[in-house]
Interface confidence: low
């Protein structure tokens, strides 16, 4: 560790005095002190002499000697006071910049240690300190404002009592900066823009930060645009806004626009795309299949995506039949806007009734014209079955009619005993009818099929059952011959109530 001579922590001299400070170390040594005039430096191997033959108040300060080669990095210091009755303060810096909650050192050094008892810190023009300003004083270093706040960004002066009057230092501007959490916050509006050639457009790029020192620019594709900047300060944030106004857009204005802001913490950028089109457009689409099948009693949401510019002038859902002239209830139709030019329209059809099958059309209009998108809704029904005994061409025949959607398949069963439904143990014979006759098959309606089972002799202690099934469910009808004719049993439960 180097040694300073004179071997005292403080040295007090009068202006004009000669001062010599000598530092000795094991190796080469260096001096560090306040920037001030009239010092001369002599170095001789492991010693260094700092001297002046005309000390002034500006030489007041702490002089530190270090030995760069010392692995312990030790240093020695001496504080020099040059006590000038006319100049009680030596101000080392007129501007101090700190971040909020740091300690701010205002470096006004007292030139005479005797004056320490009468020092105070004030704001310029004699104004008192702001309330809650917590500060301390060191004659070596000056005033420290502890945990400085943004509001304490002021011009300060150090005051000393000399002969009963207050003598002020030159002012020190304290700038307390907000702690910058990161690059400036950015907004670029709109997020997307579409215009028809010849229309006007505006793109606004704005950046804000707690600190004024940041840059913002707007670029089109990769070209920086020269746009005047408007600046403001509100909500404790600095704001810089660039507004691009285009009176009549053309295709060369289209493309990617990026708003870029940067500060010491880094850079933020956000982009938007500007489309210029020749004329108005209106496109309808759906992620759903336009042909829908739903089981009766269930619900369905029909969704249409609309891409349009300019905005829609009208839209509605229409039921096109074939069952009734009812129209969808407006409360079941709902619109959501995904963004400026894309919307989703939903028609909710809860607990579908047979009369609600058919075509549903979404119509929309803008200056580009009308567009429609039509859904076809077919309802699925479980089969309904009925059996009758009849004679066809002189032969006794069981006739089974099954109605449902999708088209039902038909199976005949013959089983022993009288029963409402054949179970496996009773089954004597099974006939599948792979191609029942289709009696009716209209769009949006049930399909009705007919199956014939020719029976030469009806066995009286047996049951004949017609079963029909499709993807929705199944139905059956049991036919029980009795001596006085035939007895029929529909299923125990009525499978379907619309």
């Amino acid at each position: 560790i180097p040694v300073i001579e004179p071997s005292v922590p403080e040295l007090v001299v009068k202006p004009g005095a000669t001062v010599t400070l000598r530092c000795v170390g094991n190796g080469s040594v260096e001096w560090d002190g306040p920037p001030s005039p009239h010092w001369t430096l002599y170095s001789d191997g492991s010693s260094s002499i700092l001297s002046t033959n005309n000390a002034t108040f500006q030489n007041t300060g702490t002089y530190r000697c270090t030995e760069p080669g010392d692995p312990l990095g030790g240093s020695a210091a001496i504080h020099l006071y040059v006590k000038d009755p006319a100049r009680p303060w030596n101000v080392l810096a007129q501007e101090v910049v700190v971040f909020e909650d740091q300690d701010a050192l205002l470096p006004c050094l007292l030139t005479d240690p005797v004056l320490e008892a009468g020092v105070s810190l004030v704001r310029v023009r004699g104004r008192p300190l702001m309330r809650h300003t917590n500060y301390s004083f060191s004659p070596w270093h000056g005033f420290t404002i502890h945990r400085a706040k943004f509001i304490q960004s002021q011009d300060y002066q150090c005051s000393a009592l000399m002969g009963g009057r207050k003598v002020m230092s030159i002012s020190i501007r304290l700038k307390v900066q907000k702690v910058i959490p990161g690059p400036p916050a950015l907004t670029l509006v709109p997020a997307e823009l579409v215009r028809i050639r010849g229309e006007a457009a505006q793109i606004v790029c704005s950046a804000s930060s707690v600190d004024v020192n940041f840059d913002v620019f707007l670029q089109h594709n990769n070209t920086k645009l020269a746009i005047p900047q408007q600046s403001d300060f509100h909500n404790n944030r600095y704001q810089k806004v660039l507004t691009l106004n285009l009176d009549q857009v053309d295709f060369q204005h289209a493309g990617n626009y990026s708003c870029v802001a940067s500060n010491v913490q880094g850079k933020h950028s956000t982009s938007m795309f500007f489309r210029v089109v020749e004329s108005a457009y209106l496109n309808l689409s759906s992620e759903q299949n336009l042909i829908q099948e739903v089981t009766v009693g269930e619900g369905l949401n029909l969704k249409v995506m609309v891409e349009a510019y300019p905005g829609l002038q009208g839209f509605n859902w229409t039921y096109l039949g074939p069952f009734s002239d009812h129209q969808p209830e407006p409360k079941l139709a709902n619109a959501t806007t995904k963004d400026t030019y894309r919307h989703t329209f939903t028609l909710s059809l809860p607990r579908l009734k047979p009369s609600e099958a058919g075509r549903y059309s979404f119509l929309a209009r803008n200056p580009g014209g009308w567009r429609a998108l039509t859904f076809e809704l077919t309802l699925r029904y479980p089969p309904e079955v009925s059996v009758i005994w009849t004679f066809i061409n002189g032969s006794g025949t069981l006739l089974c009619a099954a109605s449902g959607y999708p088209q039902p398949n038909v199976t005949w069963l013959q089983c022993s005993g009288h029963t409402d439904r054949c179970d496996e143990a009773q089954v004597l014979q099974v006939w599948d009818d792979p191609y029942p006759e289709v009696l009716s098959q209209e769009p949006f309606h049930k399909v009705t099929v007919q199956s014939l089972l020719t029976v030469e002799t009806l066995e009286h202690n047996q049951t004949y059952e017609c079963r029909a099934h499709n993807s929705v469910g199944s139905g059956s009808w049991a036919f029980i011959p009795i001596s006085a004719g035939a007895h029929t049993h529909p299923p125990d439960e009525f499978l379907f109530t619309p």
């Epitope: 960004s153 004024v212 020192n213 746009i227 005047p228 106004n245 009176d247």
Partner: antibody, heavy 118, light 107 residues
């Protein structure tokens, strides 16, 4: 409350000099851009000069009619802006306003009158 | 330099009427325009900035519009306190020129 107070106006002969001062309060003066604007019945409102903040290197700008004759300056420690006017002409007669620039000329002083006449 | 042409130079109207003052710039000023109101013997006061934005405390009967080179200031349902002179001024670089003014007088 923002306050701007001009002083230094009066009667001066053609070819003479005059220095106008403007004392500001109620805002962070060092961050502000300050301008001088004058008004006369003949010329209406006429922008004269501008000085920007330290962050903008205290850049100065002048109207063509005063370039080389007028000098704008500021003393942030005194929250004051000045207009040194030399080689004055009769057409420089008017009310001189000190203004603060923010989104426009947001704040104006009450004005000080300069008369250039023999 | 950009020239600002304001019209009309004067206007004589009654309380309750609506008036429009226009300002034309010699080149595109991209909405960097301010309007000021000045009453007799007083300093000008900022009314509108950036062509369309009302300054703090300005009544909503005042409105600014325009873009490019054409701008206007509209006053709906004139009140007695609205009489005075109105000036436009551009902020598109320097020099910051003013319009010639419009004097609004009571009929």
């Amino acid at each position: 409350e923002v306050k701007l107070e001009e002083s230094g106006g009066g009667l001066v002969q053609p070819g003479g000099s005059m220095k106008l001062s403007c004392a500001a309060s109620g805002f962070t003066f060092s961050d502000a851009w300050m301008d001088w604007v004058r008004q006369s019945p003949e010329m209406g409102l006429e922008w004269v000069a501008e000085i920007r903040s330290k962050a903008n290197n205290h850049a100065t700008f002048y109207a063509e009619s005063v370039k080389g004759r007028f000098t704008i300056s500021r003393d942030d420690s005194k929250s004051s802006v000045y207009l040194q006017m030399n080689s004055l002409r009769p057409e420089d007669t008017g009310i001189y306003y000190c203004t603060r620039v923010k989104v426009g000329f947001d704040n104006w002083g009450q004005g000080t009158t300069l008369t250039v006449s023999s | 330099d950009i020239q600002m042409t304001q019209s009309p130079a004067s206007l004589s109207v009654s309380v309750g009427e609506t008036v429009t003052i226009t300002c034309r710039a010699s080149e595109n000023i991209y909405s960097n325009l301010a309007w000021y109101q000045q009453k007799q013997g007083k300093s000008p006061q900022l009314l509108v900035h950036a062509a369309t934005n009302l300054a703090d405390g300005v009544p909503s009967r005042f409105s600014g519009s325009g873009s490019g080179t054409q701008y206007s200031l509209k006053i709906n349902s004139l009140q007695s306190e609205d009489f005075g002179s109105y000036y436009c001024q551009h902020f598109w670089g320097t020099p910051r020129t003013f319009g010639g003014g419009t004097k609004l007088e009571i009929k």
